[in-house]
């Protein structure tokens, strides 16, 4: 809605469900349709309040 | 430690123009969007702007579109905020933040972690 | 734009009571829902990400749930510290929008 798209490696269109590939120290960001750093996923004991496990099979339009 | 600072806020005149800057320590602003949210008077939370310095996509709240750029430096690690033909609605603390993103079978995960002190700019006559 | 729509818009509650609020989104934003707690004068602190995850060093009071277009963050047991404003917002689409806030206040 009005953003720029200046960088063809991390977009995809709105609509696809699937996410552009990115390194291995990043991940897809839906909400700025681009590749950023990404940390960790919070396991149990650093506390994580879901019943969703990390790991488990998540649907790419998911990401938040 | 992870720290935003912003800066530049102030009075103006209805019509007129401000900078605001965000400087960043204890990451590199080239990694994650960074955000501008800002907060009336009394008043809720209102998303401005976002960029990302690294592929230099921006987007913006209809209220500030063709008015506001958002802008990034990374080699000062700072983020800006271009304001012109300020009107009197646009009274409000504004905040830099940065969204941290988890990665979730390589999707992002994420919330605004990290925000700024808030700068108030004021627009009067 | 998603709208976002916080219910109630103030409650007043007593230390130890368990608070709900809730948000309901304009469309489906599947989890991309995080929830931030804000006192008078300071900055927004994030207290939960993608619905139900529980941002690092946030009390274990707090939690969040919901997918789609319906939200929840729960306060257990309310402390003394817990008196504040709470927002949603969701990040599914940009731009990513918050709702209108509720305040907790002391009963």
């Known amino acids: 809605m009005g953003a720029r798209r200046l960088r063809v490696r991390s977009q995809r269109s709105r609509d696809s469900s699937v996410p552009t590939q990115c390194n291995q120290t990043e991940c897809f960001d839906p909400l700025v349709r681009n590749c950023v750093s990404c940390e960790l996923f919070h396991t149990p004991d650093t506390g994580h309040t879901s019943s969703l496990e990390p790991g488990t099979a998540l649907q790419p339009q998911e990401g938040s | 430690e992870v720290q935003l600072v912003e800066s530049g806020g102030g009075l103006v005149q209805p019509g007129g123009s401000l900078r605001l800057s965000c400087a960043a320590s204890g990451f590199t602003i080239s990694s994650n969007s960074i955000h501008w949210v800002r907060q009336a008077p009394g008043k809720g939370l209102e998303w401005v702007a976002w960029?990302?310095?690294?592929?230099?996509?921006?987007d913006y709240a209809d209220s500030v579109k063709g008015r506001f750029t958002i802008s990034a430096d990374t080699s000062k690690n700072t983020a800006y905020l271009q304001m012109n033909s300020l009107r009197a609605e646009d009274t409000a603390v504004y905040y830099c933040?940065?969204?941290?993103?988890?990665?979730?079978?390589?999707?992002?995960?994420?919330?605004?972690?990290?925000w700024g002190q808030g700068t108030l700019v004021t627009v009067s006559s | 734009d998603i709208q976002m729509t916080q219910s109630p818009s103030s409650l007043s509650a007593s230390v130890g009571d368990r608070v709900t609020i809730t948000c309901r989104a304009s469309q489906d934003v599947s989890t991309a829902v995080a929830w931030y707690q804000q006192k008078p004068g300071k900055a927004p602190k994030l207290l939960i990400y993608s619905a139900s995850f529980l941002y690092s060093g946030v009390p274990s009071r707090f939690s969040g749930s919901g997918s789609g277009t319906d939200f929840t963050l729960t306060i257990s047991s309310l402390q003394p510290e817990d008196f504040a404003t709470y927002y949603c917002?969701?990040?599914?689409?940009?731009?990513?929008?918050f709702g209108q806030g509720t305040k907790v206040e002391i009963k």
């Open positions: 933040a940065r969204r941290v993103c988890y990665n979730r079978l390589g999707v992002c995960a994420g919330g605004m972690d990290y």
């Open positions: 960029v990302t310095p690294s592929g230099g996509s921006t």
């Open positions: 917002q969701q990040s599914r689409i940009s731009p990513p929008t």
